[in-house]
Amino acid sequence: YFGKLESKLSVIRNLNDQVLFIDQGNRPLFEDMTDSDCRDNAPRTIFIISMYKDSQPRGMAVTISVKCEKISTLSCENKIISFKEMNPPDNIKDTKSDIIFFQRSVPGHDNKMQFESSSYEGYFLACEKERDLFKLILKKEDELGDRSIMFTVQNED
C-alpha cells in the first residue's frame, strides 16, 4: 500500500551532468544543457517527484511526472519506459506498481540516487546511449558501481 505524501519540483541529471527532459514526442532523454538552457526548456526539464509512504519502507517510494500541456507520469510497464497521461494517484492499494519507483541514496553521497522499479525487482532507471540519443531506460543492475543507474536530483522549489 502506498499513500501520497508530498511532491517536489526537481531537475534530474545523470552522472555526466546531462539533464533529463521530455522531448516533443514525449520521450525521456538526456542532453547537455547550461543552467539557462535548463530554465529555457522548462517545464520539459522540471519533474514532479511525488513521495509516497510505503507500508514497508524499502526506499522512498516515488512517482515521476511532468506537466507540459497535461500531467504525464513515468511508467515501466513491461519493462518499457514511457510517460502515460495520468496524475500520480493519492493511493495505490498494492505492494507493486508500474509507476512507483524506490528512490535510494548511495552511502556517503546523499545527492546520488538510484530508482528501482517496484514492479521489477533489480531493475533500475538508467541512461543508455542509442545512436546519438541518451535515453532513459529500465535496466537490470548487472555490474559493480554502475554509473548509468545513478542520478542527481536537484530540488527546484
Epitope: 519502507p57 517510494a61 525487482e121
Partner: antibody, heavy 120, light 107 residues
C-alpha cells in the same frame, strides 16, 4: 558532513524507562532514516527499530515491539529512543545510525553510542 | 525475520594473510547485504554495500561477493588496522538483521 551526537550515559533501575536522544547535523534529516542499534557487552549488533521522520511512524524489530518507542522531532533534527520495563539484559551501548533515503538499507553514519546500565 | 549466520565466529591470522568470512541468509536476499567493521569501543563502519560495492574511502583489499543466500567478505592481504570484528547485515525486507559477528585476531 553528517554528524550524530547522542545523549550521555544512563544508570537505571529494573522496571524503569530510559530515553536516549540523537541530534543530527550536516545533512537532510526528514527523508533519511534514523535507526537504533544496540550492543550488549561482548555481544553483536541488534537492530531495534527506526524512523523516517517525514513518514512520522516508526518501524520496530519484533523482539522490541511494545517496549520501545522511536520518535523524531524535525524542528530540532533529533531522534529519540525510549525503552520501557528495563531489565538487566538491556544493559548495552545504544547507537543511533543514519540510514538511506526512505529506508533502512545501509547505515553510513553512526552516533558515538550511549551506555545504558540497568542495575538494582 | 530473516536470520543471518556468520562463520567462523572468530579466526586468528597474520599480517599479509588472505582472510575470508562467510555469511549465510535463511532465505534468498538477492544482493541486499552489507558488511561492517567494528573496533573495540567504536561504532561500526560501513565497508561494503549491496553485496559487493566498496564504500568510498575503504581500501581495495576489501571485497565482497555472493548473491541469494551465500556471501563472502575477503581481505586480500590483512593489515594491522584490520584486526576487528566484522558483521554482515541484510536489508531485503524493511526489517534489517545483523549476523552475529566474526572477530579477526592476531595469530
Amino acid at each position: 558532513q553528517v554528524q550524530l551526537v547522542q545523549s550521555g550515559a544512563e544508570v537505571k533501575k529494573p522496571g524503569s524507562s530510559v530515553k536516549v536522544s540523537c541530534k543530527a547535523s550536516g545533512g537532510t534529516f526528514s527523508t533519511f532514516s534514523i535507526s537504533w542499534v544496540r550492543q550488549a557487552p561482548g555481544q553483536g549488533l541488534e537492530w531495534m527499530g527506526g524512523i523516517i521522520p517525514i513518514f512520522g511512524t516508526a518501524n520496530y524489530a519484533q523482539k522490541f515491539q511494545g517496549r520501545v518507542t522511536i520518535t523524531a522531532d524535525e524542528s530540532t533534527s533529533t531522534a529519540y529512543m525510549e525503552l520501557s520495563s528495563l531489565r538487566s539484559e538491556d544493559t548495552a551501548v545504544y547507537y543511533c545510525a543514519r540510514g538511506g533515503y526512505g529506508g533502512y538499507y545501509y547505515f553510513d553514519y553512526w552516533g558515538q553510542g550511549t551506555l545504558v546500565t540497568v542495575s538494582s | 525475520d530473516i536470520q543471518m549466520t556468520q562463520s567462523p565466529s572468530s579466526l586468528s591470522a597474520s599480517v599479509g594473510d588472505r582472510v575470508t568470512i562467510t555469511c549465510r541468509a535463511s532465505q534468498s536476499i538477492s544482493n541486499r547485504l552489507n558488511w561492517y567493521q567494528q573496533k573495540p569501543g567504536k561504532a561500526p563502519k560501513l565497508l561494503i554495500y549491496k553485496g559487493s560495492t566498496l564504500q568510498s574511502g575503504v581500501p581495495s583489499r576489501f571485497s565482497g561477493s555472493g548473491s541469494g543466500t551465500d556471501f563472502t567478505l575477503t581481505i586480500s592481504s590483512l593489515q594491522p588496522e584490520d584486526f576487528a570484528t566484522y558483521y554482515c547485515q541484510q536489508h531485503y525486507v524493511w526489517s534489517t538483521t545483523f549476523g552475529q559477528g566474526t572477530k579477526v585476531e592476531i595469530k
